[in-house]
């Protein structure tokens, strides 16, 4: 009687049932970013804390060299928010002087690495026009979504302008991942 | 035969299997605000709708007095938009007037609050200042992270200012939070 | 004994254990927009991508003329980013007239539609006033939320003005789902 | 190693002009704001303004407006600073430093003296 | 433009004491305040940023504290290297100002 009230629940399932507390997942957040060489035509990457305060990894999803390391293949959901503050851009002064305006804008890109692969892949981007009466100004870019992944894969986040990040505390600036 | 075929789908679990549709889960929306005493130097609390419309709580997951309990510990994830809406701050007329600009903004956070804790934390903040041309403006603020809770947790979500609130409508200001 | 073993697991389970792998889940990513007839005070829905590139749905997960469609009621994770961008609008030349000043906006509608009710349900809207001061801007709006659905019901993305939608790049502009 | 070398000391008359130069290596000069504070003798620290050396675009504290002049040459990461109408009392140690954040100043350079004396 | 003061303006201490420095600001500046080490003769050094948090290198008897108007330096256990000049610095708005700083002489 005990094996048939199993067996329903066992034809039901197409892949090895797992507890979902085993599952790869991290939540990283902002550190200070010390002036570093970055590559040629490539928005820079952050690094992160990934163990004290609000930050951890666990069940294999590590953190090493500005990369989350995928440990094993699925669907995951990528999150991350970069919040960025600056100064007055130019913008509005080319605008009176009667030229075209290309605006100052901020950028976060979530870049998958494969290493079988030679270019990196864009999989998330929010990108913003900045350009603000105000002498000082700050604002977050948010960005969530779900991909398939491979073991292996490396995972980072790209800034347009690495010294506009707002690195003061952890809430502001933060980045994740979690197998779904 | 059959205790064969469960061996090994077991010896991979190291928690206990749960249906994932009896998880704690929550997702409320905007209700107008009425006045109420605020804590010193403490951005207000929302309050929220739990259970009309698109608002709900399930799986031991209780809203009580501005809080989303948590009754069970583990990793979830917690998400919130709040919709401001405002009249045209003086940041600009400031500016022309020369003098120096601290600009208007507009902040979200969530908060969590453990009793066995005298501080509470801020897990995730968004902050955009607000400097418009125009006369009268309106924007979302958006945030969601994971976070590892404790049973007994309490969240909320604190405005920098509870009169610019958008809380017309259910889609456009609301906090969620799920077991992951 | 291994009877005993697996007693406690399953007296914990009130609904079917089910591997995660064989849940439904889709993310689309942008397309070039057609024109097409839109229907009146009613937001144009966004047509997707839903298999080349990033973009994939599974597990009866199907995407058909600009809808999701939900293969299986319980609580799914909704999320989607617009990125806008447009040419200067008139509020601040408006604003100097010193006439009252309606801005512009931008407005991202992630929409329910059940056949057996009559009205579309909005599940999620993030707006924007859009007052720059530059003479090009682009923005996105993010939106993500959990919501209980039924089987049979259909997800779309409304916006407030298609042309305005950037369809350039995969990773600006995305809708997707996944059960919880 | 992160570096900032700036040019050697320098006297001046009242009411001339002197440039400091500061050149760095390291990083990828075009990626951070390079600033410039001055120390008076004995005094504290008086920060000047910073430039932005990916675009050439500047903003100097109002004090120094319409004296000092900061700009670059990024095909050698060389960033310099022109204060002109000197006075007795510019007489002071000047930095350049470049921060991670465009609001601190994580390294600094050894400082120039500039001494006005006539 | 942002003033900030700090007190004292001098101190002396002997080796293992527990220092303290205080800094404000003319008005509110978040958690944007930072903190620099200066030897005579040499061009200052980074301590600390964001109010509290620790310049990678740093040795840990350093530790800031404060938001707002009011902020706080303390080096627990005193070591000779740490017998200099230090400043606060405002990060919140431009002009980026400076405090007058605070010499730790030795008793």
């Known amino acids: 009687l005990k094996g048939q009230e199993f067996a329903p629940s066992h034809q039901q399932v197409y892949a090895p049932l797992r507890a979902d507390g085993d599952k790869p997942r991290a939540h990283l957040t902002v550190v200070r970013q010390t002036p570093t060489q970055h590559f040629k035509n490539q928005f820079p990457a952050l690094h992160w804390e990934h163990e004290l305060g609000l930050a951890f990894t666990k069940n294999r999803m590590n953190y090493t060299n500005k990369f989350l390391l995928i440990p094993e293949s699925g669907d995951y959901f990528i999150y991350s928010q970069v919040t960025f503050r600056g100064m007055t851009s130019e913008c509005s002064e080319i605008r009176q002087a009667g030229r075209p305006n290309k605006p100052d804008s901020i950028t976060v890109v979530i870049t998958k690495v494969t290493d079988s692969y030679p270019e990196p892949t864009q999989l998330l981007m929010g990108t913003k026009s900045v350009c603000e009466v105000g002498s000082n100004w700050f604002q977050p870019i948010y960005l969530g979504a779900m991909f398939s992944l491979q073991e292996g894969d490396k995972l980072m986040v790209n800034v347009s302008d690495i010294s506009l990040v707002d690195y003061t505390k952890e809430d502001k600036t933060f980045f994740g991942a979690f197998l779904l | 035969l059959k205790g064969q075929e469960f061996a090994p789908s077991h010896q991979q679990v190291y928690a206990p299997l749960r249906a994932d549709g009896d998880k704690p889960r929550a997702h409320l929306t905007v209700v107008r605000q009425t006045p109420t005493q605020h804590f010193k130097n403490q951005f207000p609390a929302l309050h929220w709708e739990h259970e009309l419309g698109l608002a709900f709580t399930k799986n031991r997951m209780n809203y009580t007095n501005k809080f989303l309990l948590i009754p069970e510990s583990g990793d979830y994830f917690i998400y919130s938009q709040v919709t401001f809406r405002g009249m045209t701050s003086e940041c600009s007329e400031i500016r022309q007037a020369g003098r120096p600009n601290k600009p208007d903004s507009i902040t979200v956070v969530i908060t969590k609050v453990t009793d066995s804790y005298p501080e509470p934390t801020q897990l995730l903040m968004g902050t955009k200042s607000v400097c418009e041309v125009g006369s009268n403006w309106f924007q979302p603020i958006y945030l969601g992270a994971m976070f590892s809770l404790q049973e007994g947790d309490k969240l909320m979500v604190n405005v920098s200012d509870i009169s610019l609130v958008d809380y017309t409508k259910e889609d456009k200001t609301f906090f969620g939070a799920f077991l992951l | 004994l291994k009877g005993q073993e697996f007693a406690p697991s399953h007296q914990q389970v009130y609904a079917p254990l089910r591997a995660d792998g064989d849940k439904p889940r889709a993310h689309l990513t942008v397309v070039r927009q057609t024109p097409t007839q839109h229907f009146k005070n009613q937001f144009p829905a966004l047509h997707w991508e839903h298999e080349l590139g990033l973009a994939f749905t599974k597990n009866r997960m199907n995407y058909t003329n600009k809808f999701l469609l939900i293969p299986e009621s319980g609580d799914y994770f909704i999320y989607s980013q617009v990125t806008f961008r447009g040419m200067t609008s008139e509020c601040s030349e408006i604003r100097q007239a010193g006439r009252p000043n309606k801005p512009d906006s931008i407005t991202v509608v992630i929409t329910k539609v059940t056949d057996s009710y009559p009205e579309p349900t909005q599940l999620l809207m993030g707006t924007k006033s859009v007052c720059e001061v530059g003479s090009n801007w682009f923005q996105p709006i993010y939106l993500g939320a959990m919501f209980s659905l039924q089987e049979g019901d259909k997800l779309m993305v409304n916006v407030s003005d298609i042309s305005l939608v950037d369809y350039t790049k995969e990773d600006k502009t995305f809708f997707g789902a996944f059960l919880l | 190693e992160v570096q900032l070398v700036e040019s050697g000391a320098e006297v001046k008359n009242p009411g001339a002009s002197v440039k400091v130069s500061c050149k760095a290596s390291?990083?990828?000069?075009?990626?951070?704001?390079l600033h410039w504070v001055r120390q008076a003798p004995g005094q504290g620290l008086e920060w000047m303004g910073w430039?932005?050396?990916?675009?050439?675009?500047?903003n100097y504290a109002q004090k120094f407006q319409g004296r000092v002049t900061m700009t670059r040459d990024t095909s050698i990461s060389t960033a310099y600073m022109e204060l002109s109408r000197l006075r007795s009392d510019d007489t002071a140690v000047y930095y350049c430093?470049?921060?991670?954040?465009?609001?601190?100043?994580?390294?600094w350079g050894q400082g120039t003296m500039v001494t006005v004396s006539s | 433009d942002i003033v900030m003061t700090q007190s004292p303006s001098s101190l002396s201490a002997s080796v293992g004491d527990r220092v303290t420095i205080t800094c404000r600001a003319s008005?509110?500046?978040?958690?944007?305040l930072n903190w620099y080490q200066q030897q005579p003769g040499k061009a200052p050094k980074f301590l600390i940023y964001?109010?509290?948090r620790l310049q990678s290198g740093v040795p840990s008897r350093f530790s800031g504290s404060g938001s707002g108007t009011d902020f706080t330096l303390t080096i627990n256990s005193l070591q000779p290297e740490d017998f200099a000049t230090y400043f606060c610095?405002?990060?919140?708005?431009?002009?980026?100002?400076f405090g007058p700083g605070t010499k730790v002489e030795i008793k």
């Open positions: 430093a470049v921060g991670g954040s465009y609001d601190a100043f994580d390294i």
């Open positions: 964001g109010a509290s």
């Open positions: 390291g990083y990828t000069f075009t990626g951070y704001y």
């Open positions: 430039i932005k050396p990916k675009s050439g675009g500047t």
């Open positions: 610095q405002q990060g919140y708005s431009s002009p980026f100002t």
């Open positions: 008005q509110s500046i978040s958690s944007y």
